[in-house]
Amino acid sequence: QLSRAGRSAPLAAGCPDRCEPARCPPQPEHCEGGRARDACGCCEVCGAPEGAACGLQEGPCGEGLQCVVPFGVPASATVRRRAQAGLCVCASSEPVCGSDANTYANLCQLRAASRRSERLHRPPVIVLQRGACGQGQEDPNSLRHKYNFIADVVEKIAPAVVHIELFRKLPFSKREVPVASGSGFIVSEDGLIVTNAHVVTNKHRVKVELKNGATYEAKIKDVDEKADIALIKIDHQGKLPVLLLGRSSELRPGEFVVAIGSPFSLQNTVTTGIVSTTQRGGKELGLRNSDMDYIQTDAIINYGNSGGPLVNLDGEVIGINTLKVTAGISFAIPSDKIKKFLTESHDRQAKGKAITKKKYIGIRMMSLTSSKAKELKDRHRDFPDVISGAYIIEVIPDTPAEAGGLKENDVIISINGQSVVSANDVSDVIKRESTLNMVVRRGNEDIMITVIPEEIDP
């Protein structure tokens, strides 16, 4: 229960002494104007969208909007008493560029577009940068032009810099041990994180730790091996701090930059320097299969801040810290390349969502544990001598599994050279691979079986 003293809004008539969440009315899954607190500050309700009436009986404005009466005065308890209605107006008035490559008049419009997108089961639209897409922006009052306070920049961006740890499984015991770590930075309030592709190479479990110490399992959403950029996602309730992307095309040699990373839990590493060259070719650097241009800097980039952001003095990301060639020379992937990747990733996911098919082989299975194996062995004398794997309960007729020769009571012990410990392992490989070369224990024989999953509509 919330104490009334914890509310900052002036109390509307008829508000309870204490908030009781159980009494809050149920809310629709989607709100056009986003969510807001009711007049009493007790319940989450659907807020009015931008341009809609507010105050009086109309209820509160949605997230990021404020109720303004015609003369431009924010609606207060006094205004409400004068019985004047207001309009919901965005608190932020500057244009922003979205990951769908559209320019929005303000942050509220982008958020509304993002809500619509999610309602259609498409990826959310995230803020790539302040200002219109593809438009230059020079602000003579910005920190970058007036000051050189590295610590201010760090303080501003550090909450959005994350520590990433990769775990591998030991081949037989399947125990997980850490193999590598790096950094990344949050680009959307709902948990999209950008890092280097080499930080999150395949077949690893990825764990993300925020500055406050909270840890999350991350899913790899998209990877561009050639550009060495990866997009990963954590599921987090509430809003996360984000970093906006600056324009690397506007960088000037000699400009101050800060490289930040999170090599250990709850700690950041910060190095600073200047931009040495804005476009060094990857081939020039001896990087295999790279025709990309890099930002060269003397800010030290090492394993600890690799994957983290290289920022300008406005705290805008102008690159991803990526590699150190020799002492005093480091390189970063330009933010314009990151923008392109995020926009293409958004498109890929939007298209992919529409045509996603499910892969299917036609078995019912369960994970085999030593106790389950013992129970089955007691029941069937010829049950295989295994204590882990995926036990096939049923093979559905006229399916790829039946065509491949799988039988009831088989135990799948490996697929495509990777050992199988549980039914989950099989499900994961089915999603990923187009041909499954299985080693199956049948009785006390190991049998090779090939199954080709078929694609079906979900």
Epitope: R168, L170, P171, F172, S173, R175, V177, V179, A180, T201, N202, K203, H204, I413, S414, N416, G417, Q418, S419, T435, N437, V439, D446, M448, T450
Partner: antibody
């Protein structure tokens, strides 16, 4: 640097048991599985089994099941392989080898090996 | 079990020759590994994940292949390459090829 040092050669009679030790240094002993591979004269290498030193969990080649026991002492960073009911065909060089791991591809292999322990089974 | 067939079982070549060893498996595997073993010594890893050179291994050694057929190559044979070479896969558990004994003519 990583080193695996095995115990010395043994001569055993048929039916007896042998226990070979493998002392590891230069890495975190509990972060990798330790495997045992043997090589009979003129034969291919043959995997016998493995242990996760942290948990003591083991995996064995079916061929040796019931005859081989692999153990580990975390505090001493040492792994042991005991083979019982010895027969003349168990005459071989026995190697301990650390499971290696490919960060790029996620594949497993054997990256460091002990010097080998010759076990001779003869009446 | 996955059967591994390595060929040839022995071969003789001259210094500077290109030497090729093949390894076939009875069922498709993701990766192949190659080891060198000199008399009285433990095996030494040369190639991992089919084609990646292990640390400190000269670039004259290389590996290729996929699925069921894999190849190991020495581009220019050196006297110190005299040894037995083994392929190894790791599906449900590790198995090795029977070895190829390489001699200098």
């Amino acid at each position: 640097q990583v080193q695996l040092v095995q115990s010395g050669a043994e001569v055993k009679k048929p039916g007896a048991s042998v226990k070979v030790s493998c002392k590891a240094s230069g890495y975190t002993f509990t972060d990798y599985e330790m495997h045992w591979v043997r090589q009979a004269p003129g034969q291919r290498l043959e995997w016998m089994g493995a242990i996760d030193p942290e948990t003591g969990g083991t995996a064995y080649n079916q061929k040796f099941k019931g005859r081989v026991t692999i153990t580990a002492d975390k505090s001493a960073s040492t792994a042991y392989m005991e083979l019982s009911s010895l027969r003349s065909e168990d005459t071989a060089v026995y190697y301990c080898t650390r499971e290696g791991y490919s960060y790029e591809g996620g594949g497993y292999y054997f990256d460091y090996w002990g010097q080998g322990t010759l076990v001779t089974v003869s009446s | 079990d996955i059967q591994m067939t390595q060929s040839p079982s022995s071969l003789s070549a001259s210094v500077g020759d290109r030497v090729t060893i093949t390894c076939s498996v009875s069922s498709s595997v993701s990766y192949m590994y190659w080891y060198q073993q000199k008399p009285g010594k433990a095996p030494k890893l040369l190639i991992y994940d089919t084609s990646n050179l292990a640390s400190g291994v000269p670039s004259r050694f290389s590996g290729s292949g996929s699925g069921t057929d894999f190849t190991f190559t020495i581009s220019s044979l050196q006297p110190e390459d005299i040894a037995t070479y083994y392929c190894q896969q790791w599906a449900s558990y590790p198995t090795f090829g029977q070895g190829t004994k390489l001699e200098i003519k």
